[in-house]
Amino acid sequence: EKLPKAPVITTPLETVDALVEEVATFMCAVESYPQPEISWTRNKILIKLFDTRYSIRENGQLLTILSVEDSDDGIYCCIANNGVGGAVESCGALQVKMKPKITRPPINVKIIEGLKAVLPCTTMGNPKPSVSWIKGDNALRENSRIAVLESGSLRIHNVQKEDAGQYRCVAKNSLGTAYSKLVKLEVEVFARILRAPESHNVTFGSFVTLRCTAIGIPVPTISWIENGNAVSSGSIQESVKDRVIDSRLQLFITKPGLYTCIATNKHGEKFSTAKAAATVSIAEWSKSQKDSQGYCAQYRGEVCDAVLAKDALVFFNTSYRDPEDAQELLIHTAWNELKAVSPLCRPAAEALLCNHLFQECSPGVVPTPMPICREYCLAVKELFCAKEWQAMEGKAHRGLYRSGMHLLPVPECSKLPSMHRDPTACTRLPYLDYKKENITTFPSITSSRPSADIPNLPASTSSFAVSPAYSMT
């Protein structure tokens, strides 16, 4: 009769390497009497005998995982116990090996030049796959802008046009290589003007061609604006070559104007726009001054103190030796002439003269004056001061108002810019906006077509000049 013998594991468990979906077997050979009961654990949790993913044979000495999954990684132990002595245990690891697999492949991307692009490429595999990228037919080299992240994703800083193309990621380990599908990186470029239209100073009736060239991805469209409105006359010719659009506007010049070329392209739901402007002036209309040069300062005089906006900077023209004194003297002279006019006319005329002589400063790089809007000038001339204006013109023609420096500083309305063409290019007279409500009788000279901002203010079709003139015709 055999003597009882405590269990001894004669073949300890070893580390087993297994590929996903393949079979993995642990052997636990035990000598003992009586025959032991063998149980198995994975990560200290008992493997149930009826778990169909496992096969336990040879009296429990053979554990087979029928189709390895990556989640089967872990420590497997066999425990043998026959009631004689203590239970014995042997453990070994299962290392699940896995060919590379791309779990989050890259997708097509549209990106605006200068931004950051990230193409995802998340992988699985054991050993951990290394990830590289191919652009077109060539391996992609990393540099200060282009990097493959720890996650495998490709990050491109400050995307450039030349980054556009087809990309795929490659995941590689000792067991194999996986390739993603080809994806497209499209680089969109904001519309940009390469060649701005040039300004022209021409004689009345000349033909002028304004040329504007723009680039962008997608190719931009070009539109032209004349004094704030879509160009109504003139012919436009366009050509496109290598993402560059060239637009030529031919004009027959009968009046001065500000022409703006607008290049636009679309990026998703958003648009990008670039603008460039040119002036076309008519030679005889330009007022010969010191290039309209001067400086901006707060008004420190007395005459217009109640009329001008308190915080506004006004333009002082260095054509005068001492601009602030000279302009104050001019307005002072004009003020005396206004004493005899009607109560309706006087405050309107004061507002006009002060804002004409002390024009609001335009906020560009170089200080320039912002003239009064034509509509307000006409309102004073043809509405508030119709009788006085006619009388003043008569006196002016007879030379009665001539001083040593200038005629009185009354603007020529027809040469002022219209607020309907560009509301930012001229100054409004708030006094007239307020007072117009109280006027019920309009002179017959008033246009029947109301202006947009001031009901019944005269709207003129006259041309305008870039700089106002100190004359009264």
Epitope: Q293, G294, Y295, C296, L313, T318, C361, P363, G364
Partner: antibody, heavy 121, light 107 residues
Amino acid sequence: QVQVQESGPGLVKPSQTLSLTCTVSGGSITARYYSWSWIRQPPGKGLEWMGVIAYDGSTYYSPSLKSRTSISRDTSKNQFSLHLSSVTPDDTAVYYCARGSSRVAAAFDSWGQGTQVTVSS
Amino acid sequence: SYELTQSPSVSVALRRTAKITCGGDNIGSKNTQWYQQKPGQAPVLVIYADSRRPSGIPERFSGSNSGNTATLTISGAQAEDEADYYCHVWDSSTNAWFGGGTHLTVL
């Protein structure tokens, strides 16, 4: 009182792009009636204006540098920047940023202390 | 481009009058600015719009501009006025131009 201060690398290699930033304190770069220029001074030589960015973001460049110069701004940081591409040793200079003011006929009434940039391999 | 011409150097005796000129085609039709620069320092605006002095600039600095010449005048030059002086204009295309600079020596 507005103050301007330049910052950027002191050494740039030929053919690279020089990038400098000007930080403005005590006033906004979007304030009307002001503009912001870059001006440089090569060693032992005179001042050379490079370009300007206006309060509304519009830019103008010196004709001789136009093809290589770009000025941009970051209004959230109250900064504007100069980018000069394809530099050569001739671009070695002290670079100043300066404010132009309509109150003084667009003269430059506030200057940075200047930053020395050397172009050398 | 627009060219501004300055003579490289001008000398003046202490407390005498110094005149520094800046030549340019029809410069009288443009506003001229003048800057003073001392060694190792940034330039400082001394005259703008031909003849106007910013606050803090001594009265001895004055300017004029007509025809093809703009002039910076320092009446009663002081030792601390020794520096480089640059003229500056804006052209109608929004380009700024500087003269080549004049070094003023106060003897």
